[in-house]
């Protein structure tokens, strides 16, 4: 089933999705939609990129990572319970007929009334391994034979341990770099 990601009401939620461009600037269109990935494209589109830039977005939805390097992870600002549900990240590889599509489940929890604990800084312990969307084991890279200039890293999830959005925010804030592929 879909990997679950969690955030609290009022926080920013983080839904990871990545691919590896063949070269900097050689981008692949990506869409994000609310709801499971349809047969084609994305339904209820909240954000879309083209070969150059983010060309469509709606309020509260943005890409915080470097999408020019293939980090098309979605940030949803100031979430409410209504933001719970499935989100579709679709990497629209040109020239072949099978887009990479990933369904990610966002669970919004009511805000805690107790003070937040000290922020986690030991990312080695918190982030011991990568996961792939299909299959098991280390991150796998699929080279698309019909499109030799694109390497698609089949990763839509960072790790089981990275399902709480606060930890994702910590990881991003720390400037830690995750090499994929």
């Amino acid at each position: 089933s879909e990997v679950e990601y969690r955030a609290e009401v009022g926080q920013n939620a983080y839904l990871p999705c990545f691919y590896t461009p063949a070269a900097p600037g050689n981008l692949v269109p990506v869409c994000w939609g609310k709801g499971a990935c349809p047969v084609f494209e994305c339904g209820n589109v909240v954000l879309r990129t083209d070969e150059r830039d983010v060309n469509y977005w709606t309020s509260r939805y943005w890409l915080n990572g470097d999408f020019r390097k293939g980090d098309v992870s979605l940030t949803i600002e100031n979430v409410t319970l209504a933001d719970s549900g499935i989100y579709c990240c679709r990497i629209q590889i040109p020239g072949i007929m099978n887009d990479e599509k990933f369904n990610l489940k966002l669970v919004i929890k009511p805000a805690k009334v107790t003070p937040a604990p000290t922020r986690q800084r030991d990312f080695t312990a918190a982030f011991p391994r990568m996961l792939t969307t299909r299959g098991h084991g280390p991150a796998e890279t699929q080279t698309l034979g019909s499109l030799p200039d694109i390497n698609l890293t089949q990763i839509s999830t960072l790790a089981n341990e990275l399902r709480d959005s606060r930890l994702a925010n910590d990881l991003r804030d720390s400037g830690a770099t995750i090499r994929i592929g």
Epitope: E2, A36, C37, P38, V39, N103, T133
Partner: antibody, heavy 114, light 107 residues
């Protein structure tokens, strides 16, 4: 609501070319994806291919050398052409669209026979 | 192509009863499964998408479940209008492929 209606001949001779039309109301074929699916007498359903908002097409590899899907945006119609038909192409042909193939025409039944 | 093996090919059940139809994909289709009802003279009707999401306007007597390669479809409290042929569809990979169909009859 999107409505689709197939039209075309009910009988075609072997080796001839089949041409079908799908007339669309309630949406513009300059948006979304427009598909053809057929159902054989034994109840098997086969996905044939699509034409999308930009005019890009995909054809099922099993039909690739014989199939063509085109469109006329001014008429809001799209078309299926199948060359060199045989009796194996006897089927009911449906035009289909929607996020999860929500909208289907009623189908047009084609018999290939000499 | 991803072959979809659907069973049974036909079944007969009592009004008010329950039926289950299964589809097995040759490979993991990541829950990208739809279920359709087909009656003669009409186009197929979408019942369920993404394995278990009920299409708008479809009664809750219909349900779906599954993951990986194995998927199932249930009808509870069978009614006369449920007489039809039912199909699964995988839309994870092109060319999309359908199950072989299950013809449902009421006893």
């Amino acid at each position: 609501e999107v409505q689709l209606q197939e039209s075309g001949p009910s009988l075609v001779k072997p080796s001839q070319t089949l041409s079908l039309t799908c007339s669309v109301t309630g949406d513009s074929i300059a948006s979304a994806y427009w598909n053809w699916i057929r159902k054989f007498p034994g109840n098997k359903l086969e996905y044939m291919g699509y034409i999308n908002y930009s005019g890009s097409t995909y054809y099922n590899p099993s039909l690739k050398s014989r199939i063509s899907i085109t469109r006329d945006t001014s008429q809001n119609q799209y078309y299926l052409q199948l060359n060199s038909v045989t009796t194996e192409d006897t089927a009911t042909y449906y035009c289909v669209t929607g996020d999860y193939f929500d909208y289907w025409g009623r189908g047009t039944t084609l018999t290939v026979s000499s | 192509d991803i072959q979809m093996t659907q069973s049974p090919s036909s079944l007969s059940a009592y009004l008010g009863g329950k039926v289950t139809i299964t589809c097995k994909a040759r490979q993991d289709v990541r829950k990208n499964i739809g279920w359709y009802q087909h009656k003669p003279g009409k186009g197929p009707r979408l019942l369920i998408w993404y394995t278990s999401t009920l299409q708008s306007g479809i009664p809750s007597r219909f349900s779906g479940s599954g993951s990986g390669r194995d998927y199932s479809f249930n009808i509870n409290n069978l009614e006369p209008e449920d007489i039809a042929t039912y199909y699964c569809l995988q839309y994870d990979n092109l060319p999309f492929t359908f199950g072989t169909g299950t013809k449902l009859e009421i006893r």
